[in-house]
Amino acid sequence: NADGLKEPLSFHVTWIASFYNHSWKQNLVSGWLSDLQTHTWDSNSSTIVFLCPWSRGNFSNEEWKELETLFRIRTIRSFEGIRRYAHELQFEYPFEIQVTGGCELHSGKVSGSFLQLAYQGSDFVSFQNNSWLPYPVAGNMAKHFCKVLNQNQHENDITHNLLSDTCPRFILGLLDAGKAHLQRQVKPEAWLSHGPSPGPGHLQLVCHVSGFYPKPVWVMWMRGEQEQQGTQRGDILPSADGTWYLRATLEVAAGEAADLSCRVKHSSLEGQDIVLYWEHHSSVG
C-alpha cells in the first residue's frame, strides 16, 4: 500500500463517556486514521485539536467550524439524553459508554461505514441503514434504547450523512493532505539484549526493533537460514514520534545461542535486511 497504512484504511471517531454519578461526568473524544491519532477534542474550549499539520484534510475552515459546532451540540445532547434515560435503561452508576463511528476505504474506494455503541465495554446498539439496531445479546434495554433513538428519523438522517457523505469525503482529503507523511519510509534500528532468565541453563534472547515506519515489519530469530519457530513476537507499539517499536524473543539453552541471529525486513530497507548476530552482541544489558 503506497500510503504506508494497511488496507482497509479507516477514519473513525471514538467517544468515551464516563458517568460517575447523576451530575459528574467526563468524556474523551479522538479521531483516528487507522491506528494513527489525528484529532482530539478539547472539552474545555469545545474545539477540535488537529494533531498533525495535515489533519484538516481538504475541509475548509468553515466546514471545520460547522463540524465543531455539530459535535459540541451533539456531545451536550448525548450526555443529557443518556443521563435522562439512565434509570429507564437500568444503567447503574458508575457506567461507561463507548461510541465509535467512521468509514472504511478499500483500494481507494469507500467500502462502508460503521457506528457502534457499547455499554460497560459490551456491544449494545449499532447504526445500520439509517436506524439504530440492538445487538441481540444486549437484551431488552438495548431494544428500548433503539426505540428512543429511532423516534427521530431526521436526527438519524444527520448521523447517516456524517457517515456516508462527510466521512468518505474527509478520509480521501486526509489521505491526500497527509500523503508525504504517510508515504514516508523510516529505517528501523535494531539491537539485542538478554531478557529475564527463563530458568537454569537457559537464556532469553531479545531482539529490539525501533523507530520504523510504516508499521508492517518482519522480525525473526534465525539459525543460519533457518527460521526459529520459537520466536515470540510482541505487539507492535507506537512511539511518541509516530514510528513503531517491536521486540522478538527466543528462549534457548545457554550453549545453543552462539550461531543465532535476528533478521529484520522492512520496506525502508529496500531488501537490505538488518542481521544482528548474538555472538557479536556485548553482554551489557
Epitope: E66, R72, R77, E80, N152, H154, H160, N161
Partner: antibody, heavy 112, light 110 residues
Framework: SVEESGGRLVTPGTPLTLTCTAS????????MSWVRQAPGKGLEWIGI?????STYYASWAKGRFTISKTSTTVDLKITSPTTEDTATYFC??????????WGQGTLVTVSS | AVEMTQTPASVSAAVGGTVTINCQAS??????LAWYQQKPGQPPKLLIY???TLASGVPSRFKGSGSGTEYTLTISGVQCDDAATYYC????????????FGGGTEVVVK
C-alpha cells in the same frame, strides 16, 4: 442556490403548490425547510423534509400543508388556503441544524 | 414543543453603541440556537449558529452567547448597516420536530 416559484393570487380553498428548486447541492444529503412570513409579521416555520424524505410539520401546520420532493425540487402544497395563509413563502437549506441558504421567497395572496 | 420568547420587540441604538437581544427557550435546547438577520424585502441571513459560532462572512461585532434556556445576541459598535430585524431560532427541537422562531427584534440605528 435555492429558488422558490409558484406563488400567485388564489381564492380560498383552491389548493396551491409551491416549488423550491435546489442547485449546486444534493437534496439527498440536505434537509429542506419551508418558512413563511405574513406581511409585516415575523418568521413562521412550517415544516421540514429530511434528506431521506421524512417530513415533520409545526403543530399548527399539520394537515394544512404537505411537503414532498424529487431529486432537485421540494414542493409545498397548501391544501386548502385561507386568507391567513397570505404570506411570502421561503425555502431554506438546513446544514446540520441551521438554515444557511435561503431563497428570495415567493408571494402567495389568498383573497376572494 | 419548545417555545422561543424574544425580547425586546424593538430597540434603538446610536452608531457605535451596543445592542443586546435576548432569547429564552421554554426548555433546555443544548446550545442548538441560531440567530438570523432580515432586512426589508430580503430573505433572512444566518448570523450565528450553535449559540456562539459566527457564520461565514459575518463581522466579529456580532456575538452570540448563552446555554440551557437563555441566549443573547450582542452587537458591539453598531453600524447603520445593522438596521434590521433579528430572529432567534431553536435550530432543532427533536421532541416535536420543530424549529420555532422567536418573535423578532427590530433594531433601529440613529
Amino acid at each position: 442556490s435555492v429558488e422558490e416559484s409558484g406563488g400567485r393570487l388564489v381564492t380560498p380553498g383552491t389548493p396551491l403548490t409551491l416549488t423550491c428548486t435546489a442547485s449546486g447541492f444534493s437534496l439527498s444529503t440536505y434537509a429542506m425547510s419551508w418558512v413563511r412570513q405574513a406581511p409585516g409579521k415575523g418568521l413562521e416555520w412550517i415544516g421540514i423534509i429530511s434528506s431521506s424524505g421524512s417530513t415533520y410539520y409545526a403543530s399548527w401546520a399539520k394537515g394544512r400543508f404537505t411537503i414532498s420532493k424529487t431529486s432537485t425540487t421540494v414542493d409545498l402544497k397548501i391544501t386548502s388556503p385561507t386568507t391567513e395563509d397570505t404570506a411570502t413563502y421561503f425555502c431554506a437549506r438546513e446544514t446540520w441544524y441551521w438554515l444557511d441558504l435561503w431563497g428570495q421567497g415567493t408571494l402567495v395572496t389568498v383573497s376572494s | 414543543a419548545v417555545e422561543m420568547t424574544q425580547t425586546p420587540a424593538s430597540v434603538s441604538a446610536a452608531v457605535g453603541g451596543t445592542v443586546t437581544i435576548n432569547c429564552q427557550a421554554s426548555e433546555d435546547i443544548y446550545s442548538n440556537l441560531a440567530w438570523y438577520q432580515q432586512k426589508p424585502g430580503q430573505p433572512p441571513k444566518l448570523l450565528i449558529y450553535g449559540a456562539s459560532t459566527l457564520a461565514s462572512g459575518v463581522p466579529s461585532r456580532f456575538k452570540g452567547s448563552g446555554s440551557g434556556t437563555e441566549y443573547t445576541l450582542t452587537i458591539s459598535g453598531v453600524q447603520c448597516d445593522d438596521a434590521a430585524t433579528y430572529y432567534c431560532q431553536c435550530a432543532y427541537d427533536s421532541s416535536s420536530y420543530g424549529t420555532p422562531f422567536g418573535g423578532g427584534t427590530e433594531v433601529v440605528v440613529k
